[in-house]
Every structure is written in C-alpha cells, then in structure tokens.
C-alpha cells in the first residue's frame, strides 16, 4: 500500500511539474517542484530494494578506462608543461567549501551548485570552479602575489549533454596570476598560454574571442538597459554563439522585459567582431566614447592587442562584442577559445563548435573574502579538458591508432618451465635499476602466451630467460618493432634496455 501511495505521489508530482512548465511558472517554483519530484523518485528507488538496483555511475559522471586515462594523462602533461614553462606554482584546495564561500559569486549559475547534506553544523557545497576557492585561499592566507596552476575536479548540477563532453563532475585546469602589475601584461600572457596549449594539443583550428566586462556594461548603459538588468541581459547576449540574434532578442524582450528599441541598439553592437581596428572604431563611436567604463575597457584592449602582436598570436584573437561570459565575478578582459569547424560552403566563415578554454580578469573577487575588502587583482584561464578529452578520443577512435595504457619497457619471460625464480630475480633487478618491467603471474607460463601478451600490450622489449642462456650468462632481448633478437650479457642488460628505450639514468 505504501509503495502504491508513493507511486501515486510521483505520478501527481510529475503532472504538477509539467503543469507548472506549461503555465510558465517561475524558475524558482519549477526548480523546487522538480527537487521534490526527484526526492520522491529517490524514495521509490530505495523502496524497490536490491533486486532492482541498476549498476551505473550517477548522472553526468563516467568512469575512465585505462585507454581514456592514457589520453588524459598526455593532455595533462602538455598543459602542466606549459604552466610550468610560464613559472607557475601549484596549489590544491578542498573539494568542498563552506556554502557561504560560494554563495553570490556565480550569478544565474548559482542554482547549479551541489549542496551537501548537513554534517554536523557546517553548511557545505561542492566546488563549482577553481577560481572562487583560489580567491578564498588568497584572502585567507593574506597573499597579494602568486602565479599558480590548479588541476582538479569541479561539480555542477547541470543537465549535461555528455556526448558533447559535458559532465556534472569534470576536471578544470586553471592558471591564474594574482598581483598588482602594469596593465594587460599578465592578461596577454594568459592568452599566450591558452594559444600555446591549444596549438600543442593539435586538436584543430581554434579562435580566441576577447571582450571586456567594462565594454559590455558601458554598451548596455548607452543602449538604455537599466542597471538592474545588466547581468540578466549579459546571459542572453552570451547565447549568441549558439542561437540567432532574433532568438536572443525575443528572450530579452519577451522574457526579460527589455524595450524592443533597446534590444535593437544592443544588436547593432553585439553582432560586430574584428581585430584592433574594431577597438579603434569603437573608441570613435559617438555613444560609447562618452562612457567612461567602455573607454577604459577599449583602451586596455588596444594595449592588449599590442602585446598579442609581440607574442605572435594576434591572428588567433578576435574582439567579439557578443562574448559575455556568464560568471558574475569578471571585471575586465574576458576571453573564450572555440574550436573552429571548417566552413561547408565556400565564402562562409568558420563555425565555432563550443568553448574549449576561457578566462578573464576578476579584480574584485578576493575582496569579497577579505574582512577589510582589500582587493587583489587577478587574471586567469581555465582549459576545458573534458571537451578536449572527447575530441582527442574521437580522433583516436577514427584513426584506430593503438594507444598504450602502460609504460612497461620490458617483459621478463622464460622459454622453459621451472624458471619462476630466475624471472623474479631478473624483474627485481630491473625494477631496482629504474626500468619499467613486468612478468606474467604464473609459475610455468607458455612462451607463446607470454609473447602474445607482450605484443598486445605494445611493450617494446621482451627479455627471455632460457636454461642454455642461464648457463652462458646471457639473456635474449627481442624487440617488438624490429623483431630482431640478440643475446645480451646479464650485466649489460640494464644498459642495453636503457639504450633501446632512450631512457636516462634513474632510480625509484
């Protein structure tokens, strides 16, 4: 009876939610009723007992196979090498923060924060990004100067399209420069880092869109957008990379109550993109040039382009007035890298297929945590590695290229039975010498089985121990690439493996 009642409540609540959506009820009300529906469904699930339990990962999450991890580690390696090349230190912060730390920092995205069930008095939330925890870290430790990178998982209660590389639990790779420096030098370096990483990863042609929060705010002001609507109109403008101007305009006017003529004025600006010449053109704009904020932003962008030319990356950068990154904490330059799909028709512009890196300047965020409101200017970037993993994985699948999932350099094998002791001794010697080595966990494995494993695992070398070889004091070393087999004296084996795998001297 209880189960039937609960099923009826789930049915009722589902209908209730659908009704609210049809009535265009407020997002808050719909969210609450959806939360209730999920809670009722969860209780129904618990009620079903063990026999109906479906073994799967939670929505928006996934496991990584060894093959996927190998791809991921290569991507991370490229990113970390670049961050270190630019002199960054590394930090780590807790995966959950006090709820209060994250509250009010993300604007309309705040509803996507995961709150943890109360555990003894502290209200906690899973981190939504790495930037807010970084600002909290700076304020807490009274730091005014640091260049750091941080690679870690973040959590968002999104409805992700996992096929497009979007998840509820995903990695972010952040690089940030905190400190009071001359304008646009750190900002330019961040863009240089972004371009270096995206070029090194060889995932295709990309473009970095650049704008400035002050230009956006100035533009909204001169177009006649009320102050109270800046943030919400920003989030509409930010959709221009996905939907047409007409749809964005309809949202602004129909849903957000903007006057049509104000929306049209915004449309004149946000549909423009170009290079430094557009910056100069806008500095001459009769309306924008009267707005202090916009002029400051445009002046900084002009300087930024000078540095980008010196860094040799100006051809990768586009000043795009529709870029309006959704996070509340940006205060200055903002940027977003998109992967370009080549045009299908001649004469068409390349098409952006989703953000793969983004960032900007956030000079006020640290001050939100400092008791005296002391600000620490910050600028940074975040690499969208999940999207990149998806792209790299798809490319590898298409090419059917074999991906090695281990770094084993040599398999220790035996040609006859009763040689387990000799294999164990040899593999131990190799490990002690810093060689990556493996053996099969059988007392008397067949040589054919050992060689089959060696080939499938893509291990470069196999060291074969035989009774005759033991008497002669040699080991047979066979190469997977050349198929050649040579006898190597036992005492020269480590050196020979190192030479063949180009490995420098190292120990554990």
């Amino acid at each position: 009876a209880d189960r039937a009642a609960l099923e009826e409540l789930v049915r009722l609540q589902g209908a209730h939610v659908r009704g609210l959506k049809e009535q265009k009820a407020s997002a808050e009300q719909i969210e609450e009723e959806v939360t209730k529906l999920l809670k009722l469904k969860a209780q129904l699930g618990q009620d079903e007992g063990k026999q109906k339990f479906v073994l799967k990962t939670p929505k928006g999450t996934r496991d990584y196979s060894p093959r996927q991890m190998a791809v991921r580690e290569k991507v991370f390696d490229v990113i970390i090498r670049c961050f270190k090349r630019h002199g960054a230190e590394v930090i780590d912060t807790p995966v959950f923060e006090l709820k209060e730390t994250l509250t009010g920092k993300y604007g309309e995205d705040s509803k996507l924060i995961y709150d943890l069930k109360d555990q003894g008095g502290e209200l906690l939330s899973l981190r939504y990004d790495l930037t807010v925890p970084f600002a909290r870290y700076l304020a807490m430790n009274k730091l005014t100067n640091i260049k750091r990178y941080h690679i870690a998982k973040v959590y968002r209660r999104d409805n992700p399209a996992m096929t497009r590389g979007r998840y509820r639990e995903f990695y972010q790779c952040d690089f940030d420069i905190a400190g009071q420096f001359d304008p646009m030098i750190p900002d330019a370096e961040c863009l240089k880092i972004m371009c270096e990483i995206l070029s090194s990863l060889q995932i295709g042609n990309f473009l970095v869109k650049v704008n400035d929060r002050r230009i956006l705010d100035g533009m909204f002001a001169v177009c006649g957008v009320p102050d109270s609507k800046f943030r919400t109109i920003c989030s509409s403008v930010d959709k221009l990379d996905k939907v047409s101007w007409e749809e964005v305009k309809n949202e602004m006017v129909g849903e957000k109550g903007l006057a049509p003529e104000v929306a049209d004025r915004i449309g004149d600006y946000v549909q423009q993109h170009g290079g430094v010449s557009l910056v100069e053109q806008l500095l001459q704009d009769p309306k924008l040039s009267q707005n202090k904020q916009a002029v400051e932003g445009l002046g900084d962008l002009k300087l930024l382009f000078e540095y980008l030319i010196l860094f040799g990356i100006d051809d990768k950068i586009s000043f795009d007035l529709s870029l309006a990154r959704g996070l509340d904490y940006y205060t200055g330059v903002i940027y977003e890298a998109v992967l370009l799909q080549m045009p299908t028709q001649a004469g068409e512009e390349p098409l952006g297929v989703g953000s793969i890196a983004a960032g900007g300047r956030y000079d006020g965020l640290v001050g939100m945590f400092d008791p005296k409101g002391r600000k620490v200017p910050c600028v940074g970037l975040s690499i969208g590695v999940e999207r990149i993993f998806s792209i790299v994985e798809q490319r590898l699948e298409a090419s059917e290229e074999k991906v090695r999932t281990t770094e084993t350099q040599v398999l220790v094998a035996s040609a006859q039975k009763k040689l387990l002791e000799e294999r164990l001794k040899l593999v131990s010697e190799l490990w002690d010498a810093g060689i990556k080595a493996e053996l099969l966990y059988k007392k008397n494995p067949k040589l054919l089985n050992q060689l089959q494993y060696w080939e499938e695992a893509g291990i470069p070398l196999v060291a074969i121990i035989g009774e005759q070889e033991l008497r002669d004091g040699v080991i047979k070393l066979r190469s997977v690439a050349s198929r050649e087999e040579v006898d190597v004296r036992r005492e020269d084996l480590v050196e020979e493996i190192r030479r063949r795998t180009n490995q420098p001297l190292s120990t554990c």
Epitope: A5, L6, E8, L9, L12, Q13, A15, H16, E28, E32, T35, K36, K39, L40, Q43, D115, K117, D118, L123
Partner: antibody, heavy 120, light 107 residues
C-alpha cells in the same frame, strides 16, 4: 521515538516578538520539509510557513510575510519560527509538522502545539 | 488562493453508522488532498493523503475518494473514538489551505 516538541509560546504585547522552537527526534530531520501551522482558538487550521530540508526553499502565508521568519538547524534537529511585529490576530496554537514522504505538503507527524497569545 | 469548502459543518451519528464528509476545492487540485482528524486539545492526525491513500496505522474503515474539485471521506462503521472534527487540506499549491472543518458528534 519519532516525535516533535514545540516550545517558546507565551503572552506577548502587540508589536512584540517571540521565537518558537520545535525539537525533532527519531527520524532523519534534514531529509524532511518542515512547516508551521496555526489554529486560532475555536477556529480552523492555517498553514503559516514551510522550509525545505536543505534550507533552499522557504515560503510564507501572506498574513505573516515580512514579519515571520522560518529557519532550521539540521545539526540540532530543530525548527524555528521568529515572529516579529505580532498582532492580535496572530493569537493561536502553533504546531510544527513534518511533510509526508519528506516533500509532500501534508503533515504526517505533528507536535502537541504551543500557545501564543498576543494581547495588551 | 484555493478555497476549500467542507460540508456539512457538523453531523450527528451513532456508533456503527456510515458517515460521508464532502470537500470541494475552488479549482482543480488533481489528487492533492489530505484528510485529518482532530480531537479537542490535540494536534491533528493524518488519515488520508493523495485523496485516497490510507496513512499507515489508520483503520481501514476510513477511506477517501475523488479527484479534481470534489472529494469525500467515508467512515464505513463509526466507532466511539471516531467522534472528532475532520479537516480536508489541499496540497496542490501554496498557500496550502484547509477546509473549515466538520464536527462529528454522537447522536
């Protein structure tokens, strides 16, 4: 055992304040939406306010909006109602109740009630 | 706000009688309806939720039916402990509202 116990009622002058508490035991308090419902002497029941288990959602009857504040402390298994600018018509027995199936706005467990009298 | 109207406002009956109380909603509330029993000086006790689901521990002589705007609570065979005031409540939308109550008295 599973129960709710209200406290904090009493006599207060119009314009005064009072804070009601409700102590929960015997169930996982943080899983449940909780509510305050009142009943004026000899009259029917009126739903005053509710709060979700995670604090995310609260709501108030128009008659108390801006004057009453609902809150909870999941660590202490307690529900509260802060009542300010009290009026004669707020005189009632105040019950705290738990939502059925955690989230459905029907009280399946009620406290014994605490009497609030607003009078000069 | 959704208005809930109960009828009758009071009813006299004897032990063993079958009693029906009606509740009407001013607009459709699907099956978002509960019935409570309240005795003097006590808190209300939940009898029925989702219009017809019997709360655990409540005797099977109590039953509920209806959907949309018209609902009934039926006590199939009155017992001495059933004499009390009965309230309906809509749980479809806030503010959740109660009927004015039906007092069930001994004839």
């Amino acid at each position: 055992q599973v129960q709710l116990v209200e406290s904090g009622g009493g006599l207060v002058k119009p314009g005064g304040s009072l804070r009601l508490s409700c102590a929960a035991s015997g169930f996982t308090f943080s899983d449940y939406y909780m509510t305050w419902i009142r009943q004026a002497p000899g009259k029917g029941l009126e739903w005053v306010s509710y709060i979700s288990g995670s604090f995310r959602y609260t709501n108030y009857a128009d008659s108390v909006k801006g004057r009453f504040t609902i809150s909870r402390d999941n660590a202490k298994n307690s529900l509260y109602l802060q009542m300010n600018s009290l009026r004669d018509e707020d005189t009632a027995v105040y019950f705290c109740a738990r939502y059925v199936y955690q989230v459905v706005a029907i009280g399946d467990l009620w406290g014994q009630g605490t009497l609030v009298t607003v009078s000069s | 706000d959704i208005q809930m109207t109960q009828s009758p406002s009071s009813v006299s009956a004897s032990v063993g009688d079958r009693v029906t109380i009606t509740c009407r909603a001013s607009q459709g509330i699907s099956s978002w309806l509960a019935w409570y029993q309240q005795k003097p000086g006590r808190a209300p006790k939940l009898l029925i939720f989702a219009a017809s689901s019997l709360q655990s521990g409540v005797p099977s002589r109590f039953s509920g039916s209806g959907s949309g705007t018209h609902f009934t609570l039926t006590i199939s065979s009155l017992q001495p402990e059933d004499f009390a005031t009965y309230y309906c409540q809509q749980a479809e939308s806030f503010p959740y509202t109660f009927g004015q109550g039906t007092k069930l008295e001994i004839k």
